[in-house]
C-alpha cells in the first residue's frame, strides 16, 4: 500500500494547542514506530587491532548483527584501492572450518561470532594497509559484507602508535547516538501509548480501543531491535608481517581499533540456529541497551558459550579443492 | 546488503551457445572465488565451475569441460559463464554464488554452503 493512501486516515488539526497536540499524538507513534521496526537492520562491523604485545600483529574483528541464523562466514583480504584479494577462511556450522595460509587458526567463539588468527611471517602476510572483509551469510535471507584495515596513522614510522581513544569515540558517539535516539523514542512512544490509555474514548466500543493491541505491536519491534543489538560481535583475530617494509611495526603503547559499520536495507526474519544458547551481552553497542554506561569501552568477549565445532579431522588442508591453496 | 542478479538464459537447441552473466553489488568482489551452479528439474543443486579471486584459476565439472568457460571482470564486478555445444542434459536453472564449494564436499549441496547466491536463471536445450 502506498503511504499517501493511509494520509487522510488523520485528521487535519484543530486550530488552537488542542488540535496541534491530537495531531502530534496521531503522527509521532507511526514516526516512532517506523524508528523502532528498522532498528534491527543487519550490521556487519569489523575492528582491525594491531597487537603492541606481539611483532607486527593483526586482531580483527568482525561480527553480525541480525535475527537470522548464521549459514556461512567467509573472511577476505587484499590489498588497498580494489586490488585483488584472497578468502582466509570460511566457516560453516555444520560443515566445518577451512582456512587456508597465512591464516593459522579459524574457530566459531560465539554462534555470531569467529576468530582468525594469521601467521605473523612469510610473503604472503598482511601489511598495514591490508584491507580485511567479513561476509556473514544467513539463509535465505541475504548476506552482509563489511571491510576494515588499520587507519594510516599505523604505518611503521610513526614513534609510537595513537591511542585507541579517538576511534573508539568516534565509533562509540554513533552506536551511543542512534541506540539512544531509538531507545528513547521507543520508550516515549510506550508511554504515549499508556498516556492514550488512561484518556477516556467516548462512544467506542471499549474492544476496538483497548491500547493492548497497538501497545504490543509497538513494542514488538522495539524488543525485536533490542535483540539484534544482543548479538555480540564476531572476531577474526590476524597477526601479520607487513611483507614490503623491512620495519617492524612499534612495540610499546595500547593496541587500536578501526570500526566500520555497514548498515543492510533487509532484516532477516529467521529464528537464531542456536536459540537455547545464551547470548552473552558483551559488546560496548550492547551496554546501551542494557543501560551499562560504564562498560562502553569494554572489549568484545573472547569466549563464547562453547559451541560444538565441526573441523575436518584430516586438518586444514585436508579438503582443499582444485584450485588448491590461495 | 549482498545481490548477485543472473542473466542470460533462455530457450537454445543443441549445440547452440548462451552466455550466463551475474552482476554482484554489495561486497568487494574482487576479494571472493565466484562458482556456478546449477540445479535440474527433479535433481540437486550440481557444483558447474569455479573460478578463484583474480580469474587465474578456474575448474570444471568433467560433465561441462571444453564446452563450458567461466570469466569475470573484477572492474565490472560480474562473472559469466560461456557456454557452448549445449545439451538437453544441461537443462537447469543456473546459479551465481559466491564460494567454492570443494571447500567442504560436493556431496548434497545447497545453496546455503555458499556466502552468497543469486535468484538463478533457466536454461533450456531443446529442439
Known amino acids: 500500500m502506498r503511504t499517501e493512501a493511509q494520509v487522510p486516515a488523520l485528521q487535519p488539526p484543530e486550530p488552537g494547542l488542542e488540535g496541534a497536540m491530537g495531531h502530534r499524538t496521531l503522527v509521532l507513534p507511526w514516526v516512532l514506530l517506523t524508528l523502532c521496526v528498522t532498528a534491527g537492520t543487519p550490521e556487519v562491523w569489523v575492528q582491525v587491532r594491531m597487537e603492541a604485545t606481539e611483532l607486527s600483529s593483526f586482531t580483527i574483528r568482525c561480527g553480525f548483527l541480525g535475527s537470522g541464523s548464521i549459514s556461512l562466514v567467509t573472511v577476505s583480504w587484499g590489498g588497498p584501492n580494489g586490488a585483488g584479494g584472497t578468502t582466509l577462511a570460511v566457516l560453516h556450522p555444520e560443515r566445518g572450518i577451512r582456512q587456508w595460509a597465512p591464516a593459522r587458526q579459524a574457530r566459531w567463539e560465539t554462534q555470531s561470532s569467529i576468530s582468525l588468527i594469521l601467521e605473523g611471517s612469510g610473503a604472503s602476510s598482511p601489511c598495514a594497509n591490508t584491507t580485511f572483509c567479513c561476509k556473514f551469510a544467513s539463509f535465505p535471507e541475504g548476506s552482509w559484507e563489511a571491510c576494515g584495515s588499520l587507519p594510516p596513522s599505523s604505518d611503521p614510522g610513526l614513534s609510537a602508535p595513537p591511542t585507541p581513544a579517538p576511534i573508539l569515540r568516534a565509533d562509540l558517539a554513533g552506536i551511543l547516538g542512534v541506540s539512544g535516539v531509538l531507545l528513547f523514542g521507543c520508550v516515549y512512544l510506550l508511554h504515549l501509548l499508556r498516556r492514550h490509555k488512561h484518556r477516556p474514548a467516548p462512544r467506542l466500543q471499549p474492544s476496538r480501543t483497548s491500547p493492548q493491541a497497538p501497545r504490543a505491536r509497538a513494542w514488538a519491534p522495539s524488543q525485536a531491535s533490542q535483540a539484534a543489538l544482543h548479538v555480540p560481535y564476531a572476531t577474526i583475530n590476524t597477526s601479520c608481517r607487513p611483507a614490503t617494509l623491512d620495519t617492524a611495526h612499534p612495540h610499546g603503547g595500547p593496541s587500536w581499533w578501526a570500526s566500520l559499520p555497514t548498515h543492510a536495507a533487509h532484516r532477516p526474519q529467521g529464528p537464531a540456529a542456536w536459540a537455547s544458547t545464551p547470548i552473552p551481552a558483551r559488546g560496548s553497542f550492547v551496554s546501551v541497551e542494557n543501560g551499562l554506561y560504564a562498560q562502553a569501552g569494554e572489549r568484545p568477549p573472547h569466549t563464547g558459550p562453547g559451541l560444538t565445532l565441526f573441523p575436518d579431522p584430516r586438518g586444514p588442508r585436508a579438503m582443499e579443492g582444485p584450485l588448491g591453496v590461495r | 546488503e549482498v545481490q548477485l542478479v543472473e542473466s542470460g538464459g533462455g530457450l537454445v537447441q543443441p549445440g547452440g551457445s548462451l552466455r550466463l552473466s551475474c552482476a554482484a553489488s554489495?561486497?568487494?568482489?574482487?576479494?571472493?572465488?565466484m562458482s556456478w551452479v546449477r540445479q535440474a528439474p527433479g535433481k540437486g543443486l550440481e557444483w558447474v565451475s569455479t573460478?578463484?579471486?583474480?580469474?587465474?584459476?578456474?575448474s570444471y565439472v568433467d560433465s561441462v569441460k571444453g564446452r563450458f568457460t567461466i570469466s569475470r571482470d573484477n572492474t565490472k564486478n560480474t562473472l559469466y559463464l560461456q557456454m557452448n555445444s549445449l545439451k538437453p542434459e544441461d537443462t537447469a536453472v543456473y546459479y551465481c554464488?559466491?564460494?567454492?564449494?570443494?571447500?567442504?564436499?560436493?556431496?548434497?549441496?545447497?545453496?546455503?554452503?555458499?556466502?552468497?547466491w543469486g535468484q538463478g536463471t533457466q536454461v533450456t536445450v531443446s529442439s
Open positions: 573460478i578463484n579471486s583474480n580469474g587465474g584459476r578456474t
Open positions: 554464488v559466491e564460494g567454492d564449494p570443494h571447500n567442504f564436499g560436493l556431496e548434497n549441496l545447497s545453496l546455503r554452503d555458499f556466502g552468497s
Open positions: 554489495g561486497f568487494t568482489f574482487s576479494y571472493y572465488d
